[in-house]
C-alpha cells in the first residue's frame, strides 16, 4: 500500500512537471505579428523544434510560411 502511494505521488509529480501532453509540450507557435511588414533583424534568438536557431520569433514564423513547415518554438535563446 505504502509503495503504491509513493508510486502514485511520483507519477503525479512527473505529470505536473511535464505539463500538458500533445502539441503544447512540444513548443509554442511562432507569431509573425505584422506579416506584411516583414521582420526586423534584431537578434533575439529562439530555438526551433527542428533543432535550428532562428534570429527571432518573427523570422521563424516567416520561414514556416515560405517553406510550408510547422516548426514550433522549443525555447527562448539559441539551441
Amino acid at each position: 500500500m505504502k509503495v503504491t502511494g509513493i508510486f502514485l505521488l511520483s507519477a503525479l509529480a512527473l505529470l505536473s512537471l511535464s505539463g500538458n501532453t500533445g502539441a503544447d509540450s512540444l513548443g509554442r507557435e511562432a507569431k509573425c505579428y505584422n506579416e506584411l511588414n516583414g521582420c526586423t533583424k534584431i537578434y533575439d534568438p529562439v530555438c526551433g523544434t527542428d533543432g535550428n536557431t532562428y534570429p527571432n520569433e518573427c523570422v521563424l514564423c516567416f520561414e514556416n510560411r515560405k517553406r510550408q513547415t510547422s516548426i514550433l518554438i522549443q525555447k527562448s535563446g539559441p539551441c
Epitope: 516583414g38 533583424k41 510550408q68
Partner: antibody, heavy 118, light 110 residues
Framework: QSVKESEGGLFKPTDTLTLTCTVS????????VSWVRQAPGNGLEWIGI???????DYASWAKSRSTITRNTNLNTVTLKMTSLTAADTATYFC?????????????WGPGTLVTVSS | AYDMTQTPASVSAAVGGTVTIKCQAS??????LNWYQQKPGQPPKRLIY???TLASGVSSRFKGSGSGTQFTLTISGVECADAATYYC????????????FGGGTEVVVK
Amino acid sequence: QSVKESEGGLFKPTDTLTLTCTVSGFSLSIYGVSWVRQAPGNGLEWIGIIYASGSADYASWAKSRSTITRNTNLNTVTLKMTSLTAADTATYFCAREDDTYGYTSSIWGPGTLVTVSS
Amino acid sequence: AYDMTQTPASVSAAVGGTVTIKCQASQSISSYLNWYQQKPGQPPKRLIYRASTLASGVSSRFKGSGSGTQFTLTISGVECADAATYYCQQDYSSNNIDNTFGGGTEVVVK
C-alpha cells in the same frame, strides 16, 4: 555590406560544380542567401536559398543535384551542383536578403561565369 | 507551384513615354512581389519590393501596384537609362518552386 562569388571557369559534362559566396559586413546567422543563375541571353533562374536558420530550399529542377551550405565562422555560403551538362552553362549569382526579413535579393554579387563543355 | 508569367516579352517606348509591364502569379502571393532591373553584364538591381514599395535610391518614376495574382510595373517619363530587362519575382514561397522569377521584359527606348 557585400557578397561575392568565387571564380567559375570551364567544366566538363558530369563534373561537380562548387561555388563559394563570400559575404562581408553582416552575419549569416541573421541573413539568408540565395543562388540565382542566368544562361547566356536568357532570363534569371532561381536555384535555391539558405535561410538564417541554416535550412535550405531548392528549385524543383535543382533539388536532386544541388546542395547549399554555409559556414557562419568563415562567412561563406557554398553551392554544390553535381552531374553538370551544357545546359548548366550560365552566370551564377549569390544574393543577400533585405534588412527586413522576408524580402530576398537586395544585395547581389557581380556574378561568375560557369561554362560546361567537353 | 507559384509560377510567374510576365508580359510582354519586349516593349518599345519613346523618351518621355510610359511603359507598363504585367506579372501574373499562378496562385495568390499576397503582396510578396519584387521587381528588378538588369542591364547587360550587370547583376539585377531591385527596384520595388512588397509589390509597391520603392527600394532605396530608386527614381519615383517607377511604380509598382497589385496584389494577389496580378501585378504591374509602370515606368513613367521614360529615359534612355531605363533601357534594360525587367523581372518580377515572387517572394511568397520557396517550397516546390520551379522558378521564383518571371520570364523578363526587355524595354527598348527609342
